[in-house]
Amino acid sequence: AITEAREEAKPYPLFPGPFPGSLQTDHTPLLSLPHASGYQPALMFSPTQPGRPHTGNVAIPQVTSVESKPLPPLAFKHTVGHIILSEHKGVKFNCSISVPNIYQDTTISWWKDGKELLGAHHAITQFYPDDEVTAIIASFSITSVQRSDNGSYICKMKINNEEIVSDPIYIEVQGLPHFTKQPESMNVTRNTAFNLTCQAVGPPEPVNIFWVQNSSRVNEQPEKSPSVLTVPGLTEMAVFSCEAHNDKGLTVSKGVQINIKAIPSPPTEVSIRNSTAHSILISWVPGFDGYSPFRNCSIQVKEADPLSNGSVMIFNTSALPHLYQIKQLQALANYSIGVSCMNEIGWSAVSPWILASTTEGAPSVAPLNVTVFLNESSDNVDIRWMKPPTKQQDGELVGYRISHVWQSAGISKELLEEVGQNGSRARISVQVHNATCTVRIAAVTRGGVGPFSDPVKIFIPAHGWVDYAPSSTPAPGNADPVLII
């Protein structure tokens, strides 16, 4: 007989196989079962006997020969129904059909689990023509089977718009257990139970699971997959893995580390990013988090002055962004600063303390007891005051700024005078007669100008008037703020 080969998927070579139907594997399969027989062991190949009905799709040709004899129904011959083989082995299976020669252009396609197999597959169709019929054998081979090759394979042929479908050939690839779920690393609370999960599949089934903790077997009697291990609690870090066993052998999962949550390590590298008169911006590098995320941090601030009462100011902030602006500080003061952070377990120790200083600021209060009177003989206005309390100068006094505003008949002009730090009095020339002079004084440091005092007004009469009564602001009580922690 002439053999014609049509390659369904180029460029694979021809794989001629024994006619009329064959199964070839690199190693004899463990078990091969005809599909229609409900998976009872049977011969690997059982060709359809003449005249025997067939369970697959059958096409009944309407065409008759010259003698008007009806053609027999077309159907694929029975072949092996179930092939079991090990991973990485080769397998070859086929379907065969005899087609009357009156049909032209018959092609056979392979389908797996309802999807047509296209492209680079080892699929070959061989034709064996005879006087009246052509035997067609479609072979499918896989050189090294993988789990993904598991499934139900069928052949399809189209004739006269009719589709003929073969019985399925079930391919079962067996191998070592394959993990579908492995234990995962966790951070757990000391002496608190937790669960780990392990799941592996065959075929072959069943898959049995052993758990291993720090290289000791937890369960000497295996559990069927999937397995959940309840660990009754740990006092120190442990490594867990699971072993999956089936008839093909053993697969070991990755080892996972289970850490015990602890209090964090103290922050390190506390540093000063910026200082002003009343605030300090600090940053820090967080310590080890103790396997539990930081929740918040506490900044502890104490005056470095040995004469201070040693009270500690505490500022709480979020753990991120490792940055905090400490406010409400005194100007030109020294502070010790430490940082502590917490997680769900507790607070870290305090970081190493660092020294930081605030800069000079503008005074926070105005000069006190401002008194203004007119010295008419010299045509001057005399101004006297008391300097603000040292604590509220917020720096070294460099002088005072005097604002005097002259108002008369709709005209207003403001003049500023600077006075050295030693004085507590000043004299300004009368600018306008028959006018009101409003005086305000502010203390000045290198940090800036403080607030102006409450305005003190004095009337400057026209020439010839005499008014010795001074104008003044009352001296307030002790306005020092007291911060109590």
């Epitope: 002496n191 903790q213 000791s216 937890v218 000497e220 009697q221 295996p222 009754p232 609690g233 006092t235």
Partner: antibody, heavy 118, light 106 residues
């Protein structure tokens, strides 16, 4: 509740054999291993080994290899300990104990006293 | 194999007192289990995996420790607590028991 019920006391002569039974109830027998523990008179506890109730494979500690045999009849949820060629020093109470994860013996039989005396 | 040494061998105390029983392993173990045995009875599981109370055991029993040193504590002794106590290690086969501590009424 889980129960392990052992067979009664035995008095045997040296060289004889004895078979102690341990019947389990109120749990799936083949899910947990079964251990055997020996306690000589006035002494402490000695773990003899265990049997896999699913596969039937026994494991013996070094001191109990040879004359001691663990077996099962899963159809009646029963484990057995057989001792052959009995010696006077085999005189002890033998306990079966259910064997769970982490080597915990969570339920115990009431014990079977085996006395070997001529 | 791992040797477990229990101390003291005998502990004489009165009801209401606190009992502390020690179990030391010859090398580090994963967990320690504790059993109570009364005369003529089978042992009963008290504490498993070092610190977990077994089902039906009163809360006056507690366990602690790690590595090689483990402790069973009975916070306030009741008359029914006078018995022999055994520790048993998990972590290295074969599993071994300690020699026992006899807790007796003073």
């Amino acid at each position: 509740q889980v129960q392990l019920v052992q067979s009664g006391s035995e008095l045997k002569k040296p060289g004889a054999s004895v078979k102690v039974s341990c019947k389990a109830s109120s749990y799936t027998f083949t899910t947990y291993g079964m251990s055997w523990v020996r306690q000589a008179p006035g002494q402490g506890l000695e773990w003899m080994g265990w049997i896999n109730t699913d596969s039937g494979v026994p494991t013996y500690t070094d001191d109990f290899k040879g004359r001691f045999v663990f077996s099962l009849d899963t159809s009646v949820s029963t484990a057995y300990l057989q001792i052959s060629s009995l010696k006077a020093e085999d005189t002890a109470v033998y306990y079966c104990a259910r064997y769970t994860n982490y080597g915990v013996f969570d339920y115990w039989g009431q014990g079977t006293l085996v006395t070997v005396s001529s | 194999e791992i040797v477990l040494t229990q101390s003291p061998a005998t502990l004489s105390l009165s009801p209401g007192e606190r009992a502390t029983l020690s179990c030391r392993a010859s090398s580090s173990v994963g967990y320690m289990h504790w059993y109570q045995q009364k005369p003529g009875q089978a042992p009963r599981l008290l504490i498993y995996a070092t610190s977990n109370l077994a089902s039906g055991i009163p809360a006056r029993f507690s366990g602690s420790g790690s590595g090689t040193d483990f402790t069973l504590t009975i916070s306030r002794l009741e008359p029914e607590d006078f018995a022999v106590y055994y520790c048993q290690q998990w972590g290295s086969l074969p599993f071994t028991f300690g020699g026992g501590t006899k807790l007796e009424i003073k």
